[in-house]
């Protein structure tokens, strides 16, 4: 028999990834970051 459709078996949390660049002044350059679910991780 064919299998019925189900997910992978692992819970998936859908989150928004936001890349941003922020200018912090001419003598410090820029910060480039990655925000996942509201938390800056890089």
């Amino acid at each position: 028999d064919a299998e019925f459709r189900h997910d992978s078996g692992y819970e998936v949390h859908h989150q928004k990834l936001v890349f941003f660049a922020e200018d912090v002044g001419s003598n410090k350059g820029a910060i480039i970051g990655l925000m996942v679910g509201g938390v800056v991780i890089a």
Partner: antibody
Framework: QVTLKESGPGILKPSQTLSLTCSFS??????????VGWIRQPSGKGLEWLAH???????YYNPSLKSQLTISKDTSRNQVFLKITSVDTADTATYYC???????????????WGQGTSVTVSS | MTQTPLSLPVSLGDQASISCRSS???????????LEWYLQKPGQSPKLLIY???TRFSGVPDRFSGSGSGTDFTLKISRVEAEDLGVYYC?????????FGAGTKLELK
Amino acid sequence: QVTLKESGPGILKPSQTLSLTCSFSGFSLSTAGMGVGWIRQPSGKGLEWLAHIWWDDDKYYNPSLKSQLTISKDTSRNQVFLKITSVDTADTATYYCARRGLYYGNYDAMDYWGQGTSVTVSS
Amino acid sequence: MTQTPLSLPVSLGDQASISCRSSQSIVHSNGNTYLEWYLQKPGQSPKLLIYKVSTRFSGVPDRFSGSGSGTDFTLKISRVEAEDLGVYYCFQGSRVPLTFGAGTKLELK
């Protein structure tokens, strides 16, 4: 809250096509992971799964009836349809539709059912 | 899906046990077992009690418990109440065709 309601012709003759409609509210088939299926129950007997349709139009049928069954949906109107061709007296039953989600938050089981619609096939 | 017994006479307060056996394993390739239990009361549509073998659906009393693996599964009701009477169906959602057991009628002695 989630509700489903089936509607059909009530009575039809052998060899005709049975058209059923499941109208629902409280969820949307445009939501990833959502699906609706059909189940039937002859009076005083057990339950038989017929077909299921997912939000992305993926469809599954009971192989023993597949040549007779067509499931479809109208996402904007919150409706799912089942057609059974060439009906016979053995297709006399109460027909239920039920929601079944695919992802964890939707339980991945038939968590809400309609009240059922009675169909009689008689000459 | 083979369900036993087909009829189960009980007294209120008794423990009740219903067995369901599949002819082949219903473990899905994702590792989950899609074995469910539904209760149908007279004149009503079926209602979900247990899914994925042992997880109670929201609002289901903890006197209901599901267990088993592979091909053999059990539904237990620890203390039967009047509102528990009806027909219990096991159901497998792992393989096509999805199939129900024949049902077990829980009734008063």
